[in-house]
């Protein structure tokens, strides 16, 4: 007789989740020599330990501490790129500008990127059927708490000039409820971070507005200034050209505004 199982509103654990995490871990440690010492089996055990047999609405940052410890990684603190609602372009950028890092360029971010996971209280099983939705079910679910934890640590580590890529096509270019707005902004350390520089990415080809004057950007500037961190903002009118110029900065067309 099948056991009764809690039905959540969100999609279930990503298929082949354990094998995917292990494979990603192995690949990452092969590509990044400074992480060669990492034992991926231990990483998986710690990851699993954070949510297996626990109620998926009762996960805490503390649950992820063993994983955080195993995934400890030093990235150049002045080369951090945050992003909000524009992940693909941010990742394309760091793939070209290899000395800059998004959270997903770190081991823990790379492991979990685009994956969903949850368990069930009092059983050792992974729930492939459904997982809690942040809005409809609960915010203290395994995925949300993971990203809150790693995002906080990533922001805390940042120094000097921190860059953030924002999506200029959205109604709220800066969204206080995003991970960037609710976690990262508040965990930048004013004693280490001098400036937050926002890159507002334009969507439309003919869009020549100065989106740095958007009310939500002004709101971001106000929050940052109150935290004794300087704020600057740049419009990226042509993201395709922007990427091309990062690849080939010598190109003659790259001297004009992008």
């Amino acid at each position: 007789v099948p056991r009764w199982r809690q039905q959540w509103s969100g999609p279930g654990t990503t298929k082949r989740f354990p094998e995917t995490v292990l494979a990603r871990c192995v690949k990452y440690t092969e590509i990044h020599p400074e992480m060669r010492h990492v034992d991926c089996q231990s990483v998986w055990d710690a990851f699993k330990g954070a949510f297996i047999s626990k109620h998926p609405c009762n996960i805490t940052e503390e649950d992820y501490q063993p994983l955080m410890k195993l995934g400890t990684q030093t990235v150049p603190c002045n080369k951090i790129l945050l992003w909000s609602r524009i992940k693909d372009l941010a990742h394309q950028f760091t793939q070209v500008q290899r000395d800059m890092f998004t959270l997903e360029d770190t081991l823990l971010g790379y492991l979990a990127d685009d994956l969903t996971w949850c368990g069930e209280f009092n059983t050792s099983k992974i729930n492939y059927q459904s997982c809690p939705d942040w809005r409809k079910d609960c915010s203290n679910n395994p995925v949300s708490v993971f990203w809150k934890t790693v995002s906080r640590r990533f922001a805390e580590a940042a120094c000097d000039v921190v860059h953030v890529m924002l999506n200029g096509s959205r109604s709220k270019i800066f969204d206080k409820n995003s991970t960037f707005g609710s976690v990262e902004v508040h965990n930048l350390q004013p004693e280490k971070v001098q400036t937050l520089e926002a890159w507002v990415i334009h969507g439309g080809r003919e869009d020549s507005r100065d989106l740095c004057q958007d009310p939500t950007i002004k709101e971001l500037e106000s929050i940052i200034s109150k935290r004794n961190i300087q704020f600057s903002c740049k419009n990226i009118y042509r993201p395709d050209k922007f990427l091309q110029c990062v690849k080939n900065p010598e190109d003659s067309s790259c001297t004009s505004e992008i």
Partner: antibody, heavy 121, light 110 residues
């Protein structure tokens, strides 16, 4: 002792059906992803199908058997199944079940002895 | 036709070192975990190498695995007559959404 034991093979006519079973013992069966692999006479290994651990909700099939074979598991009986329908001559092979071990990064660390399926008129 | 390409045969004399290659792509070897299997005549396959380069207990250290980019290889040093068998590489393939075995390499000890 950790063991897998296949059964259910035999001679069947083209278009016919057969159900293979794989009885597991010596380990917690529902903790493991399980797989079927076959080997045609004188040929190499060919992966056939795979089922996820616990409730077996995730199932995968090789293109050559998709729509004809169904993998399932009964954790209460510690048994893996392969229901084979619309059998063809090219399905003739020794069929092995195998366990995928997470501790060995999903290598197939335990195999059954195999059961022979012959499709012929 | 397998998405993982192995040489159909390899040979060596006792004591020699032989290497068997397994060539794939980003959708399989490039992004996934490689294992190697040994199949002695008339027997079920046996796990020889997992995670590209790890040996299960009981497998002699004469067997070693490696991976580089989208290729993997199995090396057998100090070849012995009992190593005469078929060898298969295997991994998950993201494009097929299934597992894949190489075509197999028949190793002959001369």
């Amino acid at each position: 002792e950790v063991q897998l034991l296949e059964s259910g093979g035999g001679l069947v006519q083209p278009g016919g059906s057969l159900r293979l079973s794989c009885a597991a013992s010596g380990f917690t069966f529902d903790d493991y992803v399980m797989s079927w692999v076959r080997q045609a006479p004188g040929k190499g290994l060919e992966w056939v199908s795979e089922i996820s651990e616990s409730d077996g909700s995730n199932k995968y099939y090789a293109d050559s058997v998709k729509g004809r074979f169904i993998i399932s598991r009964d954790n209460s009986k510690n048994t893996l199944y392969l229901q084979m329908n619309s059998l063809r001559a090219e399905d003739t092979a020794v069929y092995y079940c195998a366990r995928l071990e997470p501790e060995k990064y999903y290598g197939m660390d335990v195999w059954g002895q195999g059961t022979t399926v012959t499709v012929s008129s | 036709q397998s998405v993982l390409t192995q040489p159909p045969s390899a040979s060596g004399t006792p004591g020699q070192r032989v290497t068997i290659s397994c060539s794939g792509s980003n959708s399989n070897i490039g992004n996934n975990l490689v294992s190697w299997y040994q199949q002695l005549p008339g027997t079920a396959p046996k796990l020889l190498i997992y995670r590209h380069d790890h040996r299960p207990s009981g497998v002699p250290d004469r067997f070693s695995g490696s991976k580089s980019g989208t290729s993997a290889s199995l090396a057998i040093s100090g070849l012995q007559s009992e190593d005469e068998a078929d060898y298969y590489c295997a991994t998950w393939d993201d494009s097929l959404n299934g597992r894949a075995f190489g075509g197999g390499t028949k190793l002959t000890v001369l």
